[in-house]
């Protein structure tokens, strides 16, 4: 393991399409995975309106973009599926939109998670 | 090293059923998911079904469903698919795959296959 | 079910050659998009995860950039273990489907 980074060993877990995949719909995932692979949480979801759905969350593979971010935060502006990973047990249970723009003072919309999503 | 070897295929008549089974080593089987993919002679890649980590959850193809059942014992690290009701379309080779979550199906280790040939 | 669109279908390069392969997703799937190598006769191999992420083992002149339904594999100088077909994966939703594959041949 590298010193001075979190080690992800679980993370929230929500699938929308549970019925579908025949999945639960919320619970805790365990991340399993390669000794020599990071781990990390994410969350995907969707901006309807205005209103947040939430696609999926869980365990997410060794990947870059992940690497010491102790916070769930996607910065692409305005995509259609918004996606944030992060590192760090349960680091997905909460996540957040800061697009980077070139202005001075970038827009924030933090997502507080919100029944029927969490328990 | 992770090894995956599937067995299990060859000719069957249509209507009738095969069972083929996949092989694992090298790595801690029940900790990852586990798929079924295959490939009809000259085409492309089609996912077949997939199964979770402990078994409880299953997936399949609208092409298969209803008539491929995909199970997995956990104890033996091995991966299985029973196929009924064969169609020639069926014909392909079928390879198992590793996968670490069901939300990031990343195929990261794969057998070397197994030809299922359906024919009268 | 998400469809999955590759092109070209096949592409006549050198050794040395900057390839590009593009895949399209039929909606946005985030960054659920994965590559993989395959030769003739034998199993494919995972080239690129999560759209960006090299797999391990894959030499470094590899890479996979996009995000939503646009997505692009290349390969910055073609070398003779290359020649193979490339596939493209989402993983966004079930069934999990295929590109229909691009051969990248020796000119």
């Known amino acids: 393991a590298i010193l001075g980074r979190s080690e992800t060993q679980e993370c929230l877990f929500f699938n929308a399409n549970w019925e579908k995949d025949r999945t639960n719909q919320t619970g805790v995932e365990p991340c399993y995975g390669d000794k020599d692979k990071r781990r990390h949480c994410f969350a995907t979801w969707k901006n309807i309106s205005g209103s947040i759905e939430i696609v999926k969350q869980g365990c997410w593979l060794d990947d870059i973009n992940c690497y010491d971010r102790t916070d769930c935060v996607e910065k692409k502006d305005s995509p259609e599926v918004y996606f944030c990973c992060c590192e760090g047990n349960m680091c997905n249970e909460k996540f957040s939109y800061f697009p980077e723009m070139e202005v001075t003072q970038p827009t924030s919309n933090p997502v507080t998670p919100k029944p029927p999503y969490y328990n | 090293e992770v090894q995956l070897l599937e067995s299990g295929g060859g000719l069957v008549q249509p209507g009738g059923s095969l069972r083929l089974s996949c092989a694992a080593s090298?790595?801690?089987?029940?900790?990852?998911?586990m798929n079924w993919v295959r490939q009809a002679p000259g085409k492309g890649l089609e996912w077949v079904s997939g199964?979770?980590?402990?078994?409880?959850?299953?997936s399949y193809a609208d092409s298969v469903k209803g008539r491929f059942t995909i199970s997995r014992d956990n104890s033996k690290n091995t991966l299985y698919l029973q196929m009924n009701s064969l169609r020639a379309e069926d014909t392909a080779v079928y390879y198992c795959?590793?996968?670490?979550?069901?939300?990031?199906?990343?195929?990261?280790?794969w057998g070397q296959g197994t030809l299922v040939t359906v024919s009268s | 079910d998400i469809q999955m669109t590759q092109s070209p279908s096949s592409l006549s390069a050198s050794v040395g050659d900057r390839v590009t392969i593009t895949c399209r997703a039929s909606?946005?799937?985030?960054?659920?998009l994965n590559w993989y190598q395959q030769k003739p006769g034998k199993a494919p191999k995972l080239v690129i995860y999560?759209?960006?992420s090299l797999a391990s083992g894959v030499p470094s002149r590899f890479s996979g950039s996009g995000s939503g339904t646009d997505f692009t594999l290349t390969i910055s100088s073609l070398q003779p273990e290359d020649f193979a077909t490339y596939y493209c994966?989402?993983?966004?939703?079930?069934?999990?489907?295929f590109g229909g594959g691009t051969k990248v041949e020796i000119k």
């Open positions: 795959a590793r996968a670490a979550n069901w939300h990031d199906t990343a195929l990261d280790y």
């Open positions: 090298g790595f801690t089987f029940s900790d990852y998911g």
């Open positions: 199964i979770n980590y402990n078994g409880g959850y299953t």
């Open positions: 909606q946005s799937i985030s960054r659920y």
């Open positions: 999560a759209a960006t």
């Open positions: 994966q989402q993983s966004y939703d079930n069934p999990l489907t």
